[in-house]
């Protein structure tokens, strides 16, 4: 019957436009590492698809770090002459915007967003918590910024920049942050501590969004919510980095955090699922 026919329509990655990354580490975010040196290095930016400069702290970090622009291009671009920000009116979307939504093989019920190439809009879906593909964003805004066309046919990228339709330059845009501080991290960091329903007294930490700090609380051992971390370090890593401070009205935003190691993975893989 028709349901059987539908059942056997398998969504396969072979039918989708492939990611053109030569190495998976080319998709890592730039990671300055926890040290405090100031070293000029280069990384491959998957959103602009260009090798760009960043300041490296001198230790740790990740493999998306190169001594020279040439080395970066050699490792991460297939065709050095093929500049990605094209001299056309519209910036090309990253290839992963055209991938089908993929919940992955795990089942953690995480709300994520993907770009639907049929509707040309970003839509919500349930992500399982592992694998899947890169058409997977934590926020609707991030998905729109990367994959949707702007009102005038240009792409908006997730660094608060737009491709200027006149001279193809990247120009900063207002970030419309309503107050001096705004939280851009996981939503559960804003929830109150929840002890849960059982009778244990386990030492845990939660993020107190009012004071912007991680605080200890006693967890009962079951139930509760996701604002629940086994260490202060884990809590800070998950929630503190989302605390955003404006530089000035209409200016760019930066993360208010001490220079420390922030785990960097491919953007779509930064997730949290409780051990169920």
């Amino acid at each position: 019957d028709s349901e059987e026919d539908e059942e056997h329509t398998i969504i396969t990655d072979t039918e989708l436009p492939p990611l053109k990354l030569m190495h998976s580490f080319c998709a890592f975010k730039a990671d300055d590492g926890p040290c405090k040196a100031i070293m000029k290095r280069f990384f491959f930016n998957i959103f602009t698809r260009q090798c760009e400069e960043f300041i490296y702290g001198g230790c740790e970090g990740n493999q998306n770090r190169f001594e020279s622009l040439e080395e970066c291009k050699k490792m991460c671009t297939r065709d050095n002459a093929n500049r990605i920000i094209k001299t056309t009116l519209q910036q090309e979307k990253p290839d992963f915007c055209f991938l089908e939504e993929d919940p992955g093989i795990c089942r953690g019920y995480i709300t994520r967003y993907f770009y639907n190439n049929q509707t040309k809009q970003c839509e919500r879906f349930k992500y399982g918590g592992c694998l899947g593909n890169m058409n997977n964003f934590e926020t609707l805004e991030e998905c729109k910024n990367i994959c949707e066309d702007g009102p005038n046919g240009f792409q908006v990228d997730n660094y608060g920049t737009q491709l200027n339709a006149v001279n193809n330059s990247l120009t900063p845009q207002s970030t419309k942050v309503p107050s001096l501080f705004e939280f851009h991290g996981p939503s559960w960091c804003l929830t109150p501590a929840d002890r849960g329903l059982c009778r244990a007294n386990e030492n845990r930490f939660y993020y107190n969004s009012v004071i912007g700090k991680c605080r200890p609380f006693k967890y009962s051992g079951c139930g509760g919510n996701e604002n629940n971390f086994t260490s202060k370090q884990e809590c800070l890593r998950a929630c503190k980095k989302g605390f955003i401070q404006r530089i000035s009205k209409g200016g760019l935003i930066k993360t208010k955090r001490k220079r420390k190691k922030q785990r960097v993975k491919i953007a779509y893989e930064e997730i949290f699922v409780k051990n169920m």
Partner: antibody, heavy 123, light 112 residues
Framework: QVQLQQSGPGLVKPSQTLSLTCAIS??????????WSWIRQSPGRGLEWLGI?????????RYAVSVKSRITINPDTSKNQFSLQLNSVTPEDTAVYYC?????????????WGQGTLVTVSS | DIVMTQSPLSLPVTPGEPASISCRSS???????????LNWYLQKPGQSPQLLIY???NRASGVPDRFSGSGSGTDFTLKISRVEAEDVGVYYC?????????FGQGTKVEIK
Amino acid sequence: QVQLQQSGPGLVKPSQTLSLTCAISGDSVSSNSAAWSWIRQSPGRGLEWLGIIYKRSKWYNRYAVSVKSRITINPDTSKNQFSLQLNSVTPEDTAVYYCARWHSDKMWGFDDWGQGTLVTVSS
Amino acid sequence: DIVMTQSPLSLPVTPGEPASISCRSSQSLVFSFGITYLNWYLQKPGQSPQLLIYKGSNRASGVPDRFSGSGSGTDFTLKISRVEAEDVGVYYCQQYDSYPLTFGQGTKVEIK
């Protein structure tokens, strides 16, 4: 108790197609809390994951790049089984082939395996 | 592909003594929020592999508590607190951080 029962020929000629079936009992191939995979084991390559299928809102699959051009994994919902087809085999494809269930809910891992089928590619 | 490297490749053990197997991944498998995309399996002689540890440190159902998994970043360890004769076989680590899913080359545990 989930059980996976493998069937298929143990000898395949070079350039022909290797076909194996994995019959599932105690679970459903269409379950949205599982995924179904083929993995092979040979002395030279150890355990090598070949591909996986899973049903959520629709069917999905993923294949290892090393076999992507030659592999097909299909579900058969009427018989509650899934199959492996590997085209254009060579002696390098000689291995013990396992089907396995990926537990999607709590234990994210291959928690049930078939008994294994030794497939020899030889003329 | 993420390469999983195990050591030692062979581990002679004495029953009642502890044993430890190391697994190193070529990329970090631990996320900011504490999930470790790493599993451990045991393949006993003549059998199919069986899941021992999932998500880095959780014992699968029916696995004795003498088995424990730990580690973070790229370095992981499987420990057997007191080895028993039935623990002999080949132990494998496996990552599911990214496709393709990959296994370590295996550590053969045998009784001295």
